[in-house]
């Protein structure tokens, strides 16, 4: 911000000029303002060798107002600090540090994490997932007829996305094996989605529960739904080959 | 003179958002930082945040910092401070407020808001 | 955050008394020789008003009946003598650190 400094003028007083420029309410020719006009404050600007006072409308970055009934004044942030409401409220750091409560710090608490971008100290927020929206009607290659296996598949949403230091998030498709009655398509029907029809009971030593897939699994941080004894998902793969393997999306 | 005059009453349903605005007049809108402070009835003063419009940066009290954004358009010296997720709690009269060297010297008439099912 | 206890939450006085309201924050609210500590006055269904700043200073255009003091931790306001316009509530705040706060409130009743 350009300060008015005060003008060459006739002095009330030696060195005290009267009409000063801009927000000076005295000023002199020797050492610019004196003193401000309200809600202005008085900053001291080297030029040269010299000092010269002038009156700013707002303090300049680095810097922070302080009111006294005679004159504002702008004071130097601490050191680690660009922007301040004053020394004890930093509002922005300079490089290299991370703003937290209006102090800076090299490091952030613990249960917080830097956020590089805003370069300040934030929550860990953990992935929030919607409940499993309804199983799609069983399907195979888009057809609601005219097979006896298919497969059907659940999607949920991502309601909250993690921070760098937050769990990971689930699954958000699920696809399983599913039968159908064995039934003919109708003249017009071959290749329509959607129909759904009722499913049989499963066959002995065949399962309809969804096993998200093992990869996606490894992936993601623990969440007990997810959580599955690698030993449990060998045997099983021996025990029935036919065991319906889930196709999951990991974000 | 300095003014700020801020919108009008809003009654919004639980989960909703709102966004109040806040217009300057009488000074230089980005010479000053803008702040907003909330009152619920018969209760005291809260601070929520500030904004600096020379930058648009902004702040927040912890308690609100994931459900609260603050914004301006120095267009039209304009300040907005938007409230998401609203639960009943949030019915309240919402200040903005010009803060000068460490206090807040010009404030608002308030908007009400009322959060109700 | 700092706390800021005003006490008491409300008193009645006649007008020409003189009344005395007392704030009291859980730390210090000075720093460099300052006090981070300012004076409010607000008026059913209006906004607040400041009244006082850095603990002592009384803002432009407000009666001289007004006067606060105090520093560190402890700090009061002081109306005398009471006027009929003076009858509010009354809120203390601090300006030293993130997050700013407000006591409570005290509201000035007419006895």
């Known amino acids: 911000q350009n300060a008015s400094r005060g003008r060459r003028q006739r002095r009330m007083h030696p060195n005290v000029s009267q009409g000063c420029q801009g927000g000076c309410a005295t000023c002199s020719d020797y050492n610019g303002c004196l003193s401000c006009k309200p809600r202005l404050f008085f900053a001291l600007e080297r030029i040269g060798m010299k000092q010269i006072g002038v009156c700013l409308s707002s303090c300049p970055s680095g810097y922070y107002g302080t009111r006294y009934p005679d004159i504002n004044k702008c004071t130097k942030c601490k050191a680690d600090c660009d922007t301040c409401f004053n020394k004890n409220f930093c509002t922005k750091c300079k490089s290299g540090f991370y703003l937290h409560l209006g102090k800076c710090l090299d490091n952030c608490p613990e249960g917080l994490e830097a956020n590089n971008h805003t370069m300040e100290c934030v929550s860990i927020v953990h992935c929030e997932v919607s409940e499993w929206n309804p199983w799609s009607p069983c399907t195979k290659k888009g057809k609601t007829c005219g097979f006896k296996r298919g497969t059907e598949t659940r999607v949920r949403e991502i309601i909250q996305h993690p921070s760098a230091k937050g769990n990971l998030c689930p699954p958000t498709n699920e696809t399983r094996k599913c039968t159908v009655q064995r039934k003919k398509c109708q003249k017009g029907e071959r290749g329509k989605k959607g129909r759904e029809r009722k499913r049989k009971k499963p066959n002995k030593g065949e399962s309809k529960e969804a096993i998200p897939d093992s990869k996606s699994l490894e992936s993601s941080k623990e969440i007990p739904e997810q959580r599955e004894n690698k030993q449990q998902q060998k045997k099983r793969k021996v025990q029935d080959k036919q065991k319906s393997v889930s196709v999951s999306t990991v974000h | 003179q300095v003014q700020l005059v801020q919108s009008g009453a809003e009654v919004k349903k639980p989960g909703a958002s709102v966004k109040v605005s806040c217009k300057a007049s009488g000074y230089t809108f980005t010479d000053y930082s803008i702040h907003w402070v909330r009152q619920a009835p018969g209760q005291g003063l809260e601070w929520i945040g500030y904004i600096y419009p020379s930058n648009g940066d902004s702040g927040y009290n912890q308690k609100f910092k994931n459900r609260v954004t603050m914004t301006r358009d120095t267009s039209t010296s304009t300040a907005y401070m938007e409230l998401s997720r609203l639960r009943s709690e949030d019915t309240a009269v919402y200040y903005c407020?010009?803060?000068?060297?460490?206090?807040?010297?010009?404030w608002g008439q308030g908007t009400t808001l009322t959060v109700s099912s | 955050d700092i706390q800021m206890t005003q006490s008491p939450s409300s008193l009645s006085a006649s007008v020409g008394d003189r009344v005395t309201i007392t704030c009291k924050a859980s730390q210090s609210v000075d720093y460099d020789g300052d006090s981070y500590m300012n004076w409010y006055q607000q008026k059913p269904g209006k906004a607040p008003k400041l009244l006082i700043y850095a603990a002592s200073n009384l803002e432009s255009g407000v009666p001289s009946r007004f006067s606060g003091s105090g520093s560190g931790t402890d700090f009061t306001l002081t109306i005398s003598p009471v006027q009929a316009e003076d009858f509010a509530t009354y809120y203390c705040?601090?300006?030293?650190?993130?997050?700013?706060?407000f006591g409570a409130g005290t509201k000035l009743e007419l006895k």
């Open positions: 407020a010009t803060y000068f060297a460490n206090n807040f010297d010009y």
């Open positions: 705040q601090q300006s030293n650190e993130d997050p700013l706060t």
